[in-house]
């Protein structure tokens, strides 16, 4: 069954997938699709690489890692509830029926706005007297209550950058990984 990953509305979601190239630069085509992995290819393709580069992608979907070293983990930017679902990472190893397929379950939950802990000096220094958010209503900029008008998209982006840099390292070990060659 699928491994489950979670994110909140407005965050960037991270779906880990890795392989080890047989030799440096000896890349294998990879596709990411929304929906469980079919027999061949990926359904509803959101991103694709070939032997050299990312040759197809759609908005909000990108590879944050070094795909030339086999890190083909998918980042989905500014997620909404509708991004929930099964995603397929397919490593298209040459030969008949050699592909490695990984189904990853992404569950998005509503965002929660909470008071900023005082220990987050780096965050509150940039945005004094403010609430941290994990991203409300991504369809348009939202501002918080009686505070000065503050663009939550900017706050979410900063929070996501801090979080993603840690999360990428945390999840590398738990992701889908194969070795080729």
């Amino acid at each position: 069954s699928e491994v489950e990953y979670r994110a909140e509305v407005g965050q960037n979601a991270y779906l880990p997938c890795f392989y080890t190239p047989a030799a440096p630069g000896n890349l294998v085509p990879v596709c990411w699709g929304k929906g469980a992995c079919p027999v061949f290819e990926c359904g509803n393709v959101v991103l694709r690489t070939d032997e050299r580069d990312v040759n197809y992608w759609t908005s909000r979907y990108w590879l944050n890692g070094d795909f030339r070293k086999g890190d083909v983990s998918l980042t989905i930017e500014n997620v909404t509830l509708a991004d929930s679902g099964i995603y397929c990472c397919r490593i298209q190893i040459p030969g008949i029926m050699n592909d490695e397929k990984f189904n990853l379950k992404l569950v998005i939950k509503p965002a929660k706005v909470t008071p900023a802990p005082t220990r987050q000096r780096d965050f509150t220094a940039a945005f004094p007297r403010m609430l941290t958010t994990r991203g409300h209503g991504p369809a348009e900029t939202q501002t918080l209550g009686s505070l000065p008008d503050i663009n939550l998209t900017q706050i979410s982006t900063l929070a996501n950058e801090l979080r993603d840099s840690r999360l990428a390292n945390d999840l590398r070990d738990s992701g889908a990984t194969i070795r080729i060659g």
Epitope: L81, A82, I108, A139
Partner: antibody
């Protein structure tokens, strides 16, 4: 999937308060957000708010702030909607609904409770 | 608030017909839309979520489509149990908002 049980009806006096229940069964209560919705004949559907039973976090429709309070009792797997200072405008059917497996917020609905505000 | 404009408000159709109900949102809702069914005197049932996905146990004659601000629910080969009220609901932004409903009646 699970089931949601709600009392059929409540009759309350103007100015009073009422606490409506929504008892969940057949699933892990704390794993899924609960929505509350109001339906008045000829007025369509209004979203009241939602609650995460795992930590009591709530989001409210601003139109219902001060009118509605959402709570849960995890020991009995029950969600509650309390309505205060009732008027005839509050006479309606109130539904709870739980999210589905892939964050579909309105997947499964309770049968609804008809609240009648009458002296 | 996001306004969900649903049309038509009612329609008379025959068994076996294929019908489509439209919802237009006042802004892009990025497929954060559900479709609900309410039979007379009864509660609601979720039919479609995230624009195109069928809720568990929903017959395949129901389908959802659309993107951006425009979405539709299609029921093919109508059966007697499909005569009911249908609503769309957006959940990309607070507050969640509903369409005004469509009543499907037997011609």
């Amino acid at each position: 999937q699970g089931q949601l049980q709600q009392p059929g009806a409540e009759v309350v006096k103007p100015g009073a308060a009422v606490k409506l229940s929504c008892k969940a069964s057949g699933y892990t209560f704390t794993s899924y957000w609960m929505q509350w919705i109001k339906q008045r004949p000829g007025q369509g559907l209004e979203w009241i708010g939602e609650i995460d039973p795992s930590d009591n976090y709530t989001d409210y429709n601003q139109n219902f702030k001060g009118k509605a309070t959402l709570t849960v009792d995890t020991s009995s797997s029950t969600a509650y909607l309390q309505l205060s200072s009732l008027t005839s405008e509050d006479s309606a059917v109130y539904y709870c609904a739980k999210e589905g497996a892939f964050s579909s917020p309105f997947a499964y609905w309770g049968p609804g409770t008809l609240v009648t505000v009458s002296s | 608030d996001i306004l969900m404009t649903q049309s038509p408000s009612s329609m008379s159709v025959s068994l076996g017909d294929t019908v489509s109900i439209i919802c237009h949102a006042s802004q892009d809702i990025r497929s954060n839309i559900g479709w609900l069914q309410q039979k007379p005197g009864k509660s609601f049932k979720g039919l479609i979520y995230h624009g195109t996905n069928l809720e568990d146990g929903v017959p395949s004659r129901f389908s959802g489509s659309g993107s951006g601000a425009d979405y539709s629910l299609t029921i093919s080969s109508l059966e007697s149990e499909d005569f009911a009220d249908y609503y769309c609901v957006q959940y990309v932004q607070f507050p969640r908002t509903f369409g005004g409903g469509t009543k499907l009646e037997i011609k």
